[in-house]
């Protein structure tokens, strides 16, 4: 049986300060049931970058429409990039749990590097 795969096609992305960074992620299946989230870094100290269901992420927009049915594209764009945004970003699929969702599978990560703003 084909298990869901989390595909982050770019190992690295380089963006000039002040520009937007697009981080690509796709799933191969709609199951198991559960949400998708983006994080910067790995492990217990990782930073939540985007969760559609709850939270406020003013610099993050989704590449696909949030009302799109049966969406498999979970790419995001982060605006107004600064050097503080550098790091490795992970697209993570969660499996619905009770009471808490459980991490199911992570993408391989995309390293974001920030170039100095051209003068």
């Amino acid at each position: 049986e084909d298990e869901l795969q989390v595909i982050q096609p770019e190992k690295s992305v380089s963006v000039a300060a002040g520009e937007s960074a697009t981080l690509r992620c796709a799933m191969t299946s709609l199951i198991p049931v559960g949400p998708i989230m983006w994080f910067r870094g790995a492990g217990a100290g990782r930073e939540l970058i985007y969760n559609q269901k709850e939270g406020h992420f003013p610099r993050v927009t989704t590449v696909s429409e949030l009302t799109k049915r049966n969406n498999l594209d979970f790419s995001i764009s982060i605006s107004n990039i600064t050097p503080a945004d550098a790091g490795t970003y992970y697209c993570v699929k969660f499996r619905k749990g009770s009471p808490d969702d459980v991490e199911f599978k992570s993408g391989a990560g995309t390293e974001l590097s920030v170039r100095a703003k051209p003068s």
Epitope: E3, L4, I31, I36, Q52, K53, L66, R69
Partner: antibody
Framework: DVQLVESGGGVVRPGESLRLSCAAS????????MSWVRQAPGEGLEWVST??????YYADSVKGRFTISRDNSKNTLYLQMNSLRAEDTAVYYC???????????????WGLGTLVTVSS | EIVLTQSPATLSVSPGERVTFSCRAS??????IAWYQQKPGQAPRLLIY???SRDTGIPDRFSGSGSGTDFTLTISSLQSEDFGVYYC??????????FGGGTKVEIK
């Protein structure tokens, strides 16, 4: 065209078992969650169970008695119903789940249903 | 468990009239509401999802609105084929998925 065809309903006595099947066609069955929703005679809709890959979810009223499963090689969804009670009497609908956004499921296609009657 | 309350329970309407159905959630469900139509002896049919998005092939006389706890389904001009029972469903917090009790639309 998406098609969902339920079978296996019938009349049973309280405490007996029944297995419902739902044959699916017209879509990539293996990548979608699937559900069972029931409707007692003259009543509203009640969600029964959902299956993703091997992740399963049940209404409290059927937990421990009903088991949902799927066979992706046969494009078929199942509901094994044990220890049936009079209050399980209903039309059982098979439904295809649809997601919107990054999470959240509703039911975009339904079968015609199969009637289960539990009576002594 | 999130409880959905639909009102009124029954509506008597003439063809051509504008019809409004209400669905109220016991807690915030964001925009995670779907609406279904069910005719006697038939399976439910999806009309609206994400509170306001029409399903494929649904006529534009059907529209949905609302967010949070209060939702509305409107039929701008009721046609004879629109009679039946209408249900709302929440998918914000589950299990369980929950449905409203339904609103029955009868011919006046």
């Amino acid at each position: 065209d998406v098609q969902l065809v339920e079978s296996g309903g019938g009349v049973v006595r309280p405490g007996e078992s029944l297995r419902l099947s739902c044959a699916a066609s017209g879509f990539s069955f293996s990548i979608y969650a699937m559900s069972w929703v029931r409707q007692a005679p003259g009543e509203g809709l009640e969600w029964v169970s959902t299956i993703g890959a091997d992740d399963t979810y049940y209404a409290d009223s059927v937990k421990g008695r009903f088991t949902i499963s799927r066979d992706n090689s046969k494009n078929t969804l199942y509901l094994q119903m044990n220890s049936l009670r009079a209050e399980d009497t209903a039309v059982y609908y098979c439904a295809k789940d649809s997601t919107v956004g990054w999470s959240g499921d509703f039911f975009d296609y339904w079968g015609l249903g199969t009637l289960v009657t539990v009576s002594s | 468990e999130i409880v959905l309350t639909q009102s009124p329970a029954t509506l008597s309407v003439s063809p051509g009239e504008r019809v409004t159905f209400s669905c109220r959630a016991s807690q915030n469900v964001r925009s995670d509401i779907a609406w279904y139509q069910q005719k006697p002896g038939q399976a439910p049919r999806l009309l609206i999802y994400a509170a306001s998005s029409r399903d494929t092939g649904i006529p534009d006389r059907f529209s949905g609105s609302g967010s949070g706890t209060d939702f509305t389904l409107t039929i701008s001009s009721l046609q004879s084929e629109d009679f039946g029972v209408y249900y709302c469903q929440q998918y914000y917090d589950w299990p369980p998925f929950t449905f409203g009790g339904g609103t029955k639309v009868e011919i006046k």
